[in-house]
């Protein structure tokens, strides 16, 4: 009778992460008697994947019933495949021995390759807000994909950006890869409603590319413009002075009125109006009793916006 051969018909198998891999193996004879074992890798450092005789292998199931006397099919299924499972798997026949079984013959091996989708891209912006005309950096990260080939694009409001740098790690062979990209974006006063989008395309994606977004509303600070105006004199020598605070973002704003350098009133912006571009306007007024002053009065509207140093605008009130 011809000597037993271990046949692994598939040189290579490609599996999607999360799926089940079937590794086929048949023997050409029932003799010699002894168990089959599956290993990943060859040589002394090989990893035991399945032992017909003993052990607990929760992810592995056999295709056939190995307890049947005439069984020669030693194929296995490995469930919930991850990129870490990639490698060459060997089906090895052992001859029954005492005290230990002796390795008799190995199959040629089946190389298992794994394709894995990239994780949803995560976009993060700068820790501190920046003002228009400044350049800020955004980062985009996606992990766990295989194979290594991947494309990443940046968009601002649908317009593709060109000022970015991308790295895919590691540079050499690996079971899975990560991508990291940094894009530079110049802020404008109209960017409160703007979005920065990182788009990742990979062979495993059946839909459109994966997208990660960042809202520039979390990054931008638009400082207010101030205008102080005097309204016509009212009865009983009262003058109404208004401070128009325009085009600011975010809403966090505190306004202080000063009369000749002395604090008259402090208030926090509450009932603001929103502009189409997402910035806010607010108006504060001060009623000044002219008869209480002998000399001209310097009125100052002082605004502290979003924790920044105060900006102010003054108005000289003539007392005739």
């Amino acid at each position: 009778e011809e000597e037993l051969q271990v046949i692994q018909p598939d040189k290579s198998v490609l599996v999607a992460a999360g799926e089940t891999a079937t590794l086929r193996c048949t023997a050409t004879s029932l003799i010699p008697v002894g168990p089959i074992q599956w290993f990943r890798g060859a040589g002394p450092g090989r990893e035991l994947i399945y032992n017909q005789k003993e052990g607990h292998f929760p992810r592995v199931t056999t295709v056939s019933d190995l307890t049947k006397r005439n069984n020669m099919d030693f194929s296995i299924r490995i469930g919930n495949i991850t990129p870490a499972d990639a490698g060459t798997y060997y089906c090895v026949k052992f001859r029954k021995g005492s005290p230990d079984d002796v390795e008799f013959k190995s199959g040629a091996g089946t190389e298992l390759s794994v394709r894995a989708k990239p994780s949803a891209p995560v976009v993060s912006g700068p820790a501190a807000r920046a003002t228009p005309q400044h350049t800020v950096s955004f980062t985009c990260e996606s992990h766990g994909f295989s194979p290594r080939d991947i494309t990443l694009k940046w968009f601002k409001n649908g317009n593709e950006l060109s000022d970015f740098q991308t790295n895919v790690d590691p540079v050499g062979e690996s079971v899975s890869y990560s991508i990291h990209s940094t894009a530079k974006v110049v802020l404008t006063r109209e960017d409160v409603h703007s979005q920065v989008i990182c788009e990742v395309a990979h062979v495993t994606l059946q839909g459109d590319p994966l997208r990660g977004t960042a809202n520039l509303s979390e990054t931008i600070r638009v400082p207010p413009t101030l205008e102080v105006t005097q309204q016509p004199v009212r009865a009983e020598n009262q003058v109404n002075v208004t401070c128009q605070v325009r085009k600011f973002y975010p809403q966090r704003l505190q306004l202080t009125w000063l009369e000749n350098g002395n604090v008259s009133r402090t208030e926090t912006a509450s009932t603001v109006t929103e502009n189409k571009d997402g910035t806010y306007n607010w108006m504060s007024w001060l009623l000044v009793n002219v008869s209480a002053h002998r000399d001209d009065v310097k009125l100052t509207c002082q605004v502290e916006h979003d924790g920044q140093p105060a900006v102010s605008k003054s108005h000289d009130l003539k007392v005739s």
Epitope: S12, V15, A16, S113, P147, A201, V203, T204, Q206, D208
Partner: antibody, heavy 116, light 109 residues
Framework: VQLVESGGRLVQPGTPLTLSCTVS????????MGWFRQAPGKGLEYIGI?????SPYYASWVNGRFTISKTSTTMDLKMNSLRSEDTATYFC?????????????WGPGTLVTVSS | DIQMTQSPSSLSASVGDRVTITCRAS??????LAWYQQKPGKAPKLLIY???FLYSGVPSRFSGSGSGTDFTLTISSLQPEDFATYYC???????????FGQGTKVEIK
């Protein structure tokens, strides 16, 4: 799992025509689908794909002449102003479950003849 | 666009022969290459994907190899049902577009 193309016929130059690809055994919302064509005695030519979410992508030569769309069970190829060089068998195909780099299921094709 | 050059355009062979068809890409496509078999009046059938993986149900006499720009389809022992036209098809991961080779017709000698 099956794909069947329909709508192919003899048309005059300048005429529009819409081909359909009806699928069974799987969901169009899970796979990228493609359209291809093959002129008589010639090789295979890629026309375009539609992603699982419904976004179409076209070969550079298409130049807006063709439009790919889909419903829950059919994918359509709308062809404007047909020319004699558009005479071909048109195939629809589905990409493999492991990635969009190959097509593992094809329809039998439908013949479009453009002639006056 | 990427160009795929297949050779030979046709070949004559006998049953039992070893047949090799090559496909060259105008730029690297890594391993994103598929091989199809097509018979007259029929749709293409997938044989090999990702350059070297045998599609389920395809006889093991078919094998694929290569990466980058040069690829090979080998039929180890030609059978009567293998007389057909064979196409390579690339996918470019940056342009996300597909290109076919012009085909190789395998005829009976």
């Amino acid at each position: 799992v099956q794909l069947v193309e329909s709508g192919g016929r003899l048309v005059q130059p300048g005429t529009p025509l819409t081909l359909s690809c009806t699928v069974s055994g799987f969901s169009l919302s899970s796979y990228v689908m493609g359209w291809f064509r093959q002129a008589p005695g010639k090789g295979l030519e890629y026309i375009g794909i539609i992603s699982s979410s419904g976004s179409p992508y076209y070969a550079s030569w298409v130049n807006g002449r063709f439009t790919i769309s889909k419903t829950s069970t059919t994918m359509d190829l709308k062809m404007n102003s047909l020319r004699s060089e558009d005479t071909a068998t048109y195939f629809c195909a589905r990409v493999g479950p492991l990635g969009v780099d190959y097509f593992n299921i094809w329809g039998p094709g439908t013949l479009v003849t453009v002639s006056s | 666009d990427i160009q795929m050059t297949q050779s030979p355009s046709s070949l004559s062979a006998s049953v039992g022969d070893r047949v090799t068809i090559t496909c060259r890409a105008s730029q690297s496509i890594n391993s994103y290459l598929a091989w199809y078999q097509q018979k007259p009046g029929k749709a293409p059938k997938l044989l090999i994907y990702s350059a070297s993986f045998l599609y389920s149900g395809v006889p093991s006499r078919f094998s694929g190899s290569g990466s980058g720009t040069d690829f090979t389809l080998t039929i180890s022992s030609l059978q009567p049902e293998d007389f057909a036209t064979y196409y390579c098809q690339s996918w470019h991961y940056i342009s996300r577009s597909y290109t076919f080779g012009q085909g190789t017709k395998v005829e009976i000698k």
